[in-house]
């Protein structure tokens, strides 16, 4: 039971995370204009990954993208590669994912397959909330020195008489957005490699049998010396299989191990 | 077409409060800001403030902000201003005008308010 | 607050003269994030309310005749009326748009001889 909650806890954790992860891309407020200096300005600017966008009082927005590829920062091109890295490892970690699910019965899928692919889209979620981290990361690095490159001629003119004021950017909504969203996957990645082991059966070298006899039912089992009375509706031989962290009532509720997803 | 009316002059005393209207019609009201400027005969234009009527949100001219209140009632399209505590030097013609949608300059004005402070 | 400041107060002309108004802010009109200058002309004839003829600096108005030019960036803009008409006569303010409060030069009042 703390198996599947664990397990489904993680895959919607990762879920918003990555819903955020892609929000936080799509988003033009990666960076906005610091109105520290300049509070009273009409027009507003702000920057996304894609375009750049101003608005002015009127409420007029204009965006434009950002059309050449070459032309355009270094750094910049790391933080889209980045992100785009994070969404499609958060996307194929959903997917497999979504095949992981306890609750979900494909087949006669083995649990040890599920333990894998739980495993397999933990790790996804974790990379993929790594490079969102970093992404936004860099990003912010990035406003960080610019602003106080710009803080440092902030502003020029003729004499003192006529100001030209640089416009500064700061942190944007998305940079938050981002490392929120990061977070989320990289915690719901850890809940899913947490489930995994929870899932995975353990080795074992024998197949456990239970013998009864006709008055009371003692269950025999092979190395070892430990005996369970049965009492009730248990009086056909039936393969217990011991492997795996599993409650007694779990035992009981799903005898057969072709009802386990 | 886009029309922005006002009553041609107010006369009041020192000391008193008046609040001068601007109704728009031939646009939707609540999508564009409405500015109020003020002239003094002979002078030049000078920026009160602005408002949003379908927010309410304002923005005024801290020089004015004792001075002017703006406010809005959608149900009629109507822009007010209301001027309190007058003297001779808020005699001038007050005008409103809309905001233009794609720059910040307003493009519309009411043919203005001619404010006569007197006793 | 910005300061706009407007040059000369008044000019008399001819029709058909070429006429040059100039128009100084105390910061700079030019938005780095668009490249556009936050500045706006405006004509105002006797007995009227203002009428918008270019905004961005140097982008016409619709219906304004093409006689009328906008130009400059960052603090010295510039009006130009390539030949002047007699409907012309009136007083030509610059606004500053960039900043609140948005405000006004003093005007150039323009007379045909």
């Known amino acids: 039971m703390a198996v599947t909650a664990c397990q489904g806890l993680g895959f919607v954790v990762s879920l918003i995370g990555i819903a955020g992860i892609i929000a936080a891309t799509c988003m033009d407020q990666w960076s906005t204009q610091d109105l520290y200096n300049n509070p009273v300005t009409a027009v507003f600017n702000y920057q996304g990954l894609w375009r750049s966008c101003v608005r002015e009082s009127s409420g007029f927005t204009e965006c434009r993208g950002y059309f050449t590829l070459l032309g355009l920062p270094a750094m910049l091109q790391a933080v889209r590669a980045l992100m785009i890295v994070g969404i499609v490892l958060g996307a194929i970690g959903l997917l497999v994912s979504i095949f992981a699910l306890k609750c979900i019965r494909i087949g006669s899928m083995e649990d040890s397959a599920k333990a894998n692919m739980t495993l397999t889209s933990g790790i996804m979620f974790i990379v993929s909330g790594l490079c969102a981290i970093a992404g936004v990361s860099v990003f912010a690095n990035m406003l960080v020195t610019n602003f106080w490159m710009s803080t440092a001629n902030m502003y020029t003119g003729m004499g003192g008489m006529v100001q030209t004021v640089q416009t500064r950017y700061t942190f944007g909504a998305a940079l938050f957005v981002g490392w929120v969203a990061g977070g989320l996957t990289l915690i719901g990645g850890v809940m899913m490699c947490i489930a995994c082991r929870g899932l995975a059966p353990e080795e074992t070298n024998y197949k456990a049998v239970s013998y009864h006899a006709s008055g009371h039912s003692v269950a025999y089992k092979p190395g070892g010396f430990k005996a369970s009375t049965g009492f009730g509706s248990n009086t056909k031989n039936k393969k217990i299989y011991d492997g795996g962290a599993r409650t007694e009532d779990e035992v009981q509720s799903y005898p057969s191990k072709h009802d386990y997803v | 077409q886009v029309q922005l009316q006002q009553p041609g002059s107010e006369l009041v005393k020192p000391g008193a409060s008046v609040k001068l209207s601007c109704k728009a019609s031939?646009?939707?009201?609540?999508?564009?800001?409405m500015h109020w400027v003020k002239q003094r005969p002979g002078q030049g234009l000078e920026w009160i403030g602005m408002?949003?009527?379908?927010?309410?949100?304002?923005n005024y001219n801290e020089k004015f902000k004792s001075k002017a209140t703006l406010t809005v009632d959608k149900s009629s399209s109507t822009a007010y201003m209301q001027l309190s505590s007058l003297t001779s030097e808020d005699s001038a013609v007050y005008y409103c005008?809309?905001?233009?949608?794609?720059?910040?300059?307003?493009?519309?004005w009411g043919q203005g308010t001619t404010l006569t402070v007197s006793s | 607050d910005i300061v706009m400041t407007q040059s000369p107060s008044s000019l008399s002309v001819t029709a058909g003269e070429k006429v040059t108004m100039s128009c100084k802010s105390s910061?700079?009109?030019?938005?780095?994030?668009?490249?556009?200058?936050?500045l706006t002309w405006y004509q105002q004839k006797p007995g009227q309310p203002p009428k918008l003829l270019i905004y961005?600096?140097?982008t016409r108005e619709s219906g304004v005749p093409d006689r009328f030019t906008g130009s400059g960036s960052g603090t010295d803009f510039t009006l130009t009326i390539s030949s002047v008409q007699a409907e012309d006569l009136a007083v030509y303010y610059c606004?500053?748009?960039?900043?609140?409060?948005?405000?006004f030069g003093s005007g150039t009042k323009l007379e045909i001889k």
């Open positions: 031939g646009y939707t009201f609540t999508s564009y800001w």
């Open positions: 961005w600096a140097s």
């Open positions: 910061q700079s009109l030019l938005n780095s994030g668009n490249q556009k200058n936050y």
């Open positions: 005008a809309r905001r233009y949608y794609g720059s910040i300059s307003p493009d519309y």
């Open positions: 606004q500053n748009d960039y900043s609140y409060p948005f405000t």
């Open positions: 408002i949003h009527p379908n927010s309410g949100s304002t």
